[in-house]
């Protein structure tokens, strides 16, 4: 399987909410012994290997934000902790998973990574990630709502498998 990032850049004004999205592509094993660990984290734009560094989002680590379930089941993060930080990650039946960030500020700008790990018999088998940039803008020239820029088809499918 692969992860697609429908949008490579999200440009939002301060105070707005945004939902960053990744999509699981390709055949997904739905066996009983297969589960998917999905999560989000921030990373550095300066890294040679995109998404290799895992930093918290609003002080919540990738462990705090993870979803753990089978195949294309729906799931949400544990509400209170994430919501206290204005965050919610979710996953639907179609392989889409997302993180919603509320009341954005300039300090939320940066590179965000989604990570999917396929786990078989309690062992990590396959991991893929996707990256996207969030740019929160201030001042009179900032957009009134979030504007999204599609990934090139090459980018959106070219996700590194480890």
């Amino acid at each position: 399987f692969k992860v697609a990032t429908p949008y490579s850049l999200y440009v939002c004004p301060e105070g707005q909410n945004v939902t960053l999205t990744c999509r699981l592509l390709g055949p997904v094993d739905k066996g009983h012994d297969v589960t998917f660990y999905k999560t989000w984290y921030r990373s550095s734009r300066g890294e040679v290997q995109t998404c290799s560094e895992r930093r918290p989002i609003r002080n919540l680590t990738f462990q705090d934000l993870h979803l753990h379930h089978g195949g294309h089941q729906a799931a949400n993060t544990s509400h209170d902790l994430a919501q206290r930080h204005g965050l919610e990650s979710a996953s639907d039946h179609h392989g889409n998973f997302s993180i919603t960030m509320r009341n954005l500020t300039l300090l939320d700008s940066g590179l965000y990574c989604c990570l999917v790990v396929e786990i078989r018999h309690h062992h990590s088998e396959h991991r893929v990630h996707g990256a996207m940039e969030l740019q929160v803008q201030t001042g009179k020239d900032a957009p009134s709502n979030c504007v999204v820029y599609p990934s090139s088809s090459q980018d959106s499918e070219n996700i590194t498998a480890a």
């Epitope: 850049l9 440009v11 921030r42 990373s43 550095s44 734009r45 300066g46 930093r55 609003r58 002080n59 930080h85 500020t105 300039l106 300090l107 700008s109 940066g110 590179l111 740019q135 803008q137 201030t138 001042g139 020239d141 900032a142």
Partner: antibody
Amino acid sequence: QVQLVQSGAEVKKPGASVKVSCKASGYTFTSYWLHWVRQAPGQGLEWMGYIIPNTLHTDYNQKFKDRVTMTRDTSTSTVYMELSSLRSEDTAVYYCARLDGDYDYALDYWGQGTLVTVSS
Amino acid sequence: DIVMTQTPLSLSVTPGQPASISCRASESVEYYGTSFMQWYLQKPGQPPQLLIYTASNVESGVPDRFSGSGSGTDFTLKISRVEAEDVGVYYCQQSRKVPYTFGQGTKLEIK
């Protein structure tokens, strides 16, 4: 290594404009926001504004908003700060500085500074 | 705008002795547990150089005699043993909100 190299000193008359350049090297130019900070002789540091090179977005300190314009040229990895309607109190050293906007939001690399003297 | 107030404005220290500079913000510079407060040193005739970021993290290449502490509105820069090369003006700066603002500066000289 990361370097920000600024243009040379300028002497301008009141009412004129000045355009200072800042050439970046040693990193991916479009990945980091560039800020401008000025320092009048013997005074402290004053933030002027920033430009985001990949989207061209700018935001300026209200104090300068009608007089300052920040632009960029990605082909040469250079940002520019133009200040118009100069007055004597604009005499200062002007610095460009890179913002580490990944997590820390600190100005981690600075240009050497450009002295702008406004005098009749 | 967030107003940054530094104390003292000047400091004269004997080499080998400690030094401490305080900075108070007019409102909290914290965002989800991280304080967006920096410290810079400007040596004579040079641009400022980053010493400490997010209140307590020492920038790479900065001697470990420098340390930062504090959260919310009150911050401190400490030099455990002042050396001759530490002379210059120290500035605190917040990046919690634009416009970014700096303290007035603290001039450190050697006795």
